[in-house]
């Protein structure tokens, strides 16, 4: 039968866990990204924020995975889903928050928001 969407989300969670566990030096040289509201349109917003980090191989797979959860093309400098752009946080903190929230969605069966 149809594959539940949770399998794809599990892959994303595993990648985020991998990033947080393998972090030795400051992630992406301490680059800062816009914080996002972890609500509706979260995946597109997360991608729009992270896409502005370039040259950081550690998060390239995450950026790519997030594109499969967002219906539209996301380019650097695009902020259609980032409703509020008032706080910047380190990429490492961003990834930790994203991991925490995706785990929460996974537990409650809300795979795609």
């Amino acid at each position: 039968g149809p594959v539940p969407p949770s399998t794809a989300l599990r892959e994303l969670i595993e990648e985020l866990v991998n990033i947080t566990q393998n972090q030795k030096a400051p992630l992406c040289n301490g680059s800062m990204v816009w914080s996002i509201n972890l609500t509706a349109g979260m995946y597109c917003a997360a991608l729009e924020s992270l896409i502005n980090v370039s040259g950081c191989s550690a998060i390239e797979k995450t950026q790519r995975m997030l594109s499969g959860f967002c219906p539209h093309k996301v380019s650097a400098g695009q902020f259609s889903s980032l409703h509020v752009r008032d706080t910047k946080i380190e990429v490492a903190h961003f990834i930790t928050k994203l991991l925490s929230y995706t785990k929460q969605l996974f537990r409650h069966g809300q795979q795609f928001n």
């Epitope: 039968g1 149809p2 594959v3 539940p4 969407p5 399998t7 794809a8 599990r10 892959e11 994303l12 950026q63 790519r64 995975m65 594109s67 499969g68 959860f69 967002c70 219906p71 093309k73 380019s75 795979q111 795609f112």
Partner: antibody, heavy 123, light 107 residues
């Protein structure tokens, strides 16, 4: 290591049927969308069909719609392509391809390709 | 149906830059991918998301996409880059491949 191994190709008469299989290994098969892409002798690449990894949606090229059926068995890590009412123009190498994740898998990029299996439709 | 058009062939001298274009209506609104295929081999993804390189793809491969045209650029072209190149995009629930470009490295 991610691997895709196609089988089931061969010579078939016009109007005949064939079922291609693709055995996948080295990744969580059920998570990923999968596609079939073909290449006629001396010609370019042509996408045939895709099966999403989330939600079970299927997609087909107009040239095969109604004749080909894509399916997958996640317990066996295998992708299939049932080809009916075959025509001479279906003669090609058929590649199994690992696609992307999520409901919008097509935003990801076709990462891994099998070696291909040859289908020849001729009388 | 959606179409992606590429030049049939591009010739380049070793060490020079080869540019391959891919044209399609509002292609810049979509993600473009590029594949390299050598004779008798399966295609290999060299660019995804317009300009991103998968791991293992040399830095001399780069891509861009805006308006109606995506471009694959090979800087400092080497003999091993001689191959067929295909662009690809998704439109209306179908993947579309470009017509293909044969890159010949002279000499």
């Amino acid at each position: 290591e991610v691997q895709l191994l196609e089988s089931g190709g061969g010579l078939v008469q016009p109007g005949g049927s064939l079922r291609l299989s693709c055995a996948a290994s080295g990744f969580t098969f059920s998570s990923y969308a999968m596609s079939w892409v073909r290449q006629a002798p001396g010609k370019g690449l042509e996408w045939v069909s895709a099966f999403s990894g989330s939600g079970g949606s299927t997609y087909y090229a107009d040239s095969v719609k109604g004749r080909f059926t894509i399916s997958r068995d996640n317990s066996k890590n295998t992708l299939y392509l049932q080809m009916n009412s075959l025509r001479a123009e279906d003669t090609a190498v058929y590649y199994c391809v690992q696609d992307g994740l999520g409901p919008y898998f097509y935003n990801y990029g076709m990462d891994v390709w099998g070696q291909g299996t040859t289908v020849t439709v001729s009388s | 149906s959606y179409e992606l058009t590429q030049p049939p062939s591009v010739s380049v001298s070793p060490g020079q830059t080869a540019s391959i274009t891919c044209s399609g209506d509002k292609l810049g609104d979509k993600y473009a991918c590029w594949f390299q295929q050598k004779p008798g081999q399966s295609p290999v993804l060299v660019i995804y998301h317009d300009s991103k390189r998968p791991s293992g793809i040399p830095e001399r491969f780069s891509g861009s996409n805006s308006g109606d045209t995506a471009t694959l650029t090979i800087s400092g072209t080497q003999a091993m880059d001689e191959a067929d190149y295909y662009c690809q995009a998704w439109d209306s629930s179908t993947y579309v491949f470009g017509t293909g470009t044969k890159v010949t490295v002279l000499g």
